[in-house]
């Protein structure tokens, strides 16, 4: 079952799927001046069995001016540095990321791919959030969103992440210091100086899953 909407947006944060559930579709989009080859797929589809999942179909782009099929070559670094997962810019996954049963990894780039990747997620998909560069988490509750089916409709859970500019926060003189954290997440001595990497403390994430570096998105 496809999710009706995109995952929720959080101010000054980006989201990333660490793996894609079977049934996920990725549109075959080409950058300006290029189009899908005539017999080319409209989308890639994450399919599989109990032991292995992979992307069916290959996206191929050709110059709008010619009718040639394209060579499958690795794009230049500047071409692959900004890829979007629906509304989010995201880099490729590290190739050594542990596989999750029933999930596909980030598909490799294709030549002349559009800079924005448009995914169609399915129920059960989870995406993870972190603050963009220059912002930090004022509060980090569960920083993920899951597409769930309730009463016959799909909805994404709301991530409890609040991102703020580095120097915006304050702890007033005489305010109690935060107590020691039972969850073992690092805390700041003074709120203005917190610079911990957001995903360093993503304890909810499966231990087997490596986090990827997020690229920034400013709104």
């Amino acid at each position: 079952e496809l999710c009706d909407d995109d995952p929720p947006e959080i101010p000054h944060a980006t989201f990333k799927a660490m793996a894609y559930k079977e049934g996920t579709m990725l549109n075959c989009e080409c950058k300006r001046g290029f189009r899908r080859i005539k017999s080319g797929s409209l989308y890639m589809l994450c399919t599989g069995n109990s032991s292995h999942s992979s992307w069916d179909n290959q996206c191929q782009c050709t110059s709008s001016a010619t009718r040639n099929t394209t060579k499958q070559v690795t794009p230049q670094p500047e071409e692959q540095k900004e890829r979007k997962t629906t509304e989010m810019q995201s880099p490729m996954q590290p190739v050594d990321q542990a596989s999750l049963p029933g999930h596909c990894r980030e598909p490799p780039p294709w030549e002349n791919e559009a800079t924005e990747r448009i995914y169609h997620f399915v129920v059960g998909q989870m995406v993870y959030y972190q603050c963009v560069q220059g912002y930090r988490a004022l509060h980090r509750g569960p920083a993920e969103s899951v597409c769930k089916m309730t009463h016959g409709k799909t909805r994404w859970t709301q991530p409890q992440l609040i991102c703020t500019g580095e120097m915006e926060t304050s702890q007033f003189p005489g305010e109690e210091k935060p107590q020691a954290s039972p969850e073992g997440r690092p805390e700041s001595e003074t709120s203005c100086l917190v610079t911990t990497t957001d995903f360093q403390i993503q304890t909810e994430m499966a231990a087997t899953m490596e986090t990827s570096i997020f690229t920034t998105e400013y709104q």
């Epitope: 929720p8 947006e9 959080i10 101010p11 004022l138 509060h139 980090r140 509750g141 569960p142 709301q158 991530p159 409890q160 992440l161 609040i162 703020t164 915006e168 926060t169 304050s170 702890q171 007033f172 305010e175 109690e176 210091k177 935060p178 954290s181 969850e183 997440r185 805390e187 700041s188 709120s191 917190v194 709104q219």
Partner: antibody
Framework: QVQLQQPGAELVRPGVSLKISCKGS????????MHWVRQSHAKSLEWIGV????????LYNQKFKGKATMTVDKSSSTAYLELARLTSEDSAIYYC????????WGQGTTLTVSS | DVVMTQSPASLSASVGETVTITCRAS??????LEWYQQKQGKSPQLLVY???TLAEGVPSRFSGSGSGTQFSLKINSLQPEDFGTYYC?????????FGGGTKLEMK
């Protein structure tokens, strides 16, 4: 079920300070930040600030800096709003509200500042 | 600060009617906007978050739309329990600000 419990009313003299409590129950308290909102006849709803129930880190509306101080006590799942040097202008209803989208609100504490 | 301007300030309608309340932000708020309903003597209740997502338990006759600076809340087939005051609020950048409210009264 999720509940945010606040005292119903407080009557205080001008010049004193007051600490209003907001006790969360029915959920994991530290998962959700806590906001404080003031409602007065003159100004409708005004956001005072937000505090991380996890770290104690707080973000204030500039308008309330020096007037309001937010704290949390994780052991009792309670957020506090302390209001200093109270005047009749501070008479209002003070609400706590949970999470990014203010999905649950306390019933409000009606503060009356009067001599 | 972002100024949220709600219109109309008050509105009279009958049960079964459809009404629309609008909210204009003085700056781009993207889709970071909530709608709340408040009844006399009660605390506000979340109706819609992120401009268009219905909060859990909210009837489907309510719907939110818009992005950027223009937002609206539509109530189809008004029910007796829908009368009260409605507020919009943005959460893009601080301070978060609320609209002045729209009082929906029974005609």
């Amino acid at each position: 079920q999720v509940q945010l419990q606040q005292p119903g009313a407080e009557l205080v003299r001008p010049g004193v300070s007051l600490k209003i409590s907001c006790k969360g129950s029915g959920y994991t308290f530290t998962d959700y930040a806590m906001h404080w909102v003031r409602q007065s006849h003159a100004k409708s709803l005004e956001w005072i600030g937000v505090i991380s129930t996890y770290s104690g880190d707080a973000l204030y509306n500039q308008k309330f800096k020096g007037k309001a101080t937010m704290t949390v006590d994780k052991s009792s799942s309670t957020a506090y709003l302390e209001l200093a040097r109270l005047t009749s202008e501070d008479s209002a209803i003070y609400y706590c509200a949970r999470g990014v989208t203010f999905d649950y609100w306390g019933q409000g504490t009606t503060l009356t500042v009067s001599s | 600060d972002v100024v949220m301007t709600q219109s109309p300030a008050s509105l009279s309608a009958s049960v079964g009617e459809t009404v629309t309340i609008t909210c204009r932000a003085s700056e781009n708020s993207y889709s970071y906007l909530e709608w709340y309903q408040q009844k006399q003597g009660k605390s506000p209740q979340l109706l819609v978050y992120n401009a268009k997502t219905l909060a859990e338990g909210v009837p489907s006759r309510f719907s939110g739309s818009g992005s950027g600076t223009q937002f609206s809340l539509k109530i189809n087939s008004l029910q007796p329990e829908d009368f009260g005051t409605y507020y919009c609020q943005h959460h893009y950048g601080t301070p978060y600000t609320f609209g002045g409210g729209t009082k929906l009264e029974m005609k």
